[in-house]
Interface confidence: low
């Protein structure tokens, strides 16, 4: 079954390359057990970044070499991806599903287009 | 109240296939998946996968992936699991079982009686 | 696959003890741990969830803590209906796992 999930259009990364952003999806029931997809498009290329299944009674948690980090509240989803360089600018799509209990119901945001901007390298001090 | 009806005993020859049913009862079918286990003589209990009634979804145990086929009636409330290419391995106590989405989602608070299944020449 | 090793894998206490069992995960599951008991030809009954929460109907004497890997049962003032198989279930990820079973025996 379709659902809405919501996301910002665009996120500037950090100078760390860190960029954030919350997704948001419509639930008309509480999910027992929710799973985040992010995936990065580019071009016709879309690739899983990261994924997570939460449940409403614990916290979100990435696999610990993930380079997603994430916090849940309700019906949000507070997503950090690490890491960014400038060749990871592009969008970046929040897919969300939940699992459990049935119905199934699953929604992909229309994406965020992350920009990365690599910081200039601190010149030589003498 | 939540009742989930299995017949005793199956007695099936090595090689062949069996086909398990579970009719359950009082409480909407489509709302709560349905879990299989495994419980050998004597032995501890084992989680061969479970279906989603609303849109007939499974996922196994690997272990079981080429063993356990797993199907819902959802006009007669039943969920069945068929067990193909019988060995001697294969005879247990088979137990459907329900999640209590109120009280925790991966715990099975109802259970039905179990079917025995006895594989033999 | 997580494992779910229990121990003791028998255990005998006499009547009004308190006994207690244990569970280890091979990795964390946070809280999402059950209990169950199986007396002999029977189906096996819900006792725990969620590590600490008691299911429906189940005496009080029977309580459940832990969290990460380390889990425990704790059966106090034993009695004679208690004599069962416990067996602890993982629900963190799939395939959902459980221990091999502590068989009590009143002494």
């Known amino acids: 079954k379709g659902m809405h999930a919501a996301q910002p259009a665009v996120v500037l990364a950090s100078s760390r390359g860190v960029a954030s952003f919350v997704c948001e999806y419509g639930s008309s029931g509480n999910a027992a057990e929710v799973r985040v997809t992010m995936l990065r498009q580019a071009g016709s290329q879309m690739t899983e970044v990261c994924a997570a299944t939460y449940t409403v009674e614990d916290e979100l948690a990435f696999l610990d070499d993930s380079t997603c980090t994430g916090t849940s509240s309700g019906n949000k989803v507070n997503l950090t991806i690490q890491g960014l360089r400038a060749m990871g600018t592009g969008l970046y799509i929040c897919k969300v599903e939940l699992m459990y209990p049935p119905p199934y119901y699953v929604g992909m945001g229309n994406g965020t287009q992350i920009y990365v901007i690599d910081p200039e390298p601190c010149p030589d001090s003498d | 109240q939540v009742q989930l009806q299995q017949p005793g005993t199956e007695l099936v020859k090595p090689g062949a296939s069996v086909k398990l049913s579970c009719k359950a009862s009082?409480?909407?079918?489509?709302?709560?998946?349905m879990h299989w286990v495994k419980q050998r003589p004597g032995q501890g209990l084992e989680w061969i996968g479970n279906?989603?009634?609303?849109?007939?979804?499974?996922r196994f145990n690997e272990k079981f992936k080429n063993k356990a086929t797993l199907t819902e009636d959802k006009s007669s409330s039943t969920a069945y699991m068929q067990l193909s290419s019988l060995t001697s391995e294969d005879s247990a106590v088979y137990y459907c079982?329900?999640?209590?989405?109120?009280?925790?989602?991966?715990?099975?608070?109802?259970w039905g009686q179990g079917t025995l299944v006895t594989v033999s020449a | 696959d997580i494992q779910m090793n229990q121990s003791p894998s028998s255990l005998s206490a006499s009547l009004g003890d308190t006994i207690t069992i244990t569970c280890h995960a091979s990795?964390?599951?946070?809280?999402?741990l059950s209990w169950y008991q199986q007396k002999p030809g029977n189906i096996p009954k819900l006792l725990i969830y969620?590590?600490?929460n008691l299911h429906t109907g189940v005496p009080s004497r029977f309580s459940g803590s832990g969290s990460g890997t380390g889990f425990t049962l704790t059966i106090s003032s034993l009695q004679p209906e208690d004599i069962a198989t416990y067996y602890c279930?993982?629900?963190?990820?799939?395939?959902?796992?459980f221990g091999g079973g502590t068989k009590l025996e009143i002494k």
């Open positions: 969620k590590s600490s």
């Open positions: 279930q993982q629900g963190q990820s799939y395939p959902w796992t």
């Open positions: 079982a329900r999640s209590n989405y109120g009280s925790g989602w991966a715990w099975f608070a109802y």
């Open positions: 990795q964390n599951i946070n809280v999402w």
């Open positions: 009082g409480y909407t079918f489509t709302s709560y998946w």
């Open positions: 279906i989603n009634p609303s849109n007939g979804g499974t």
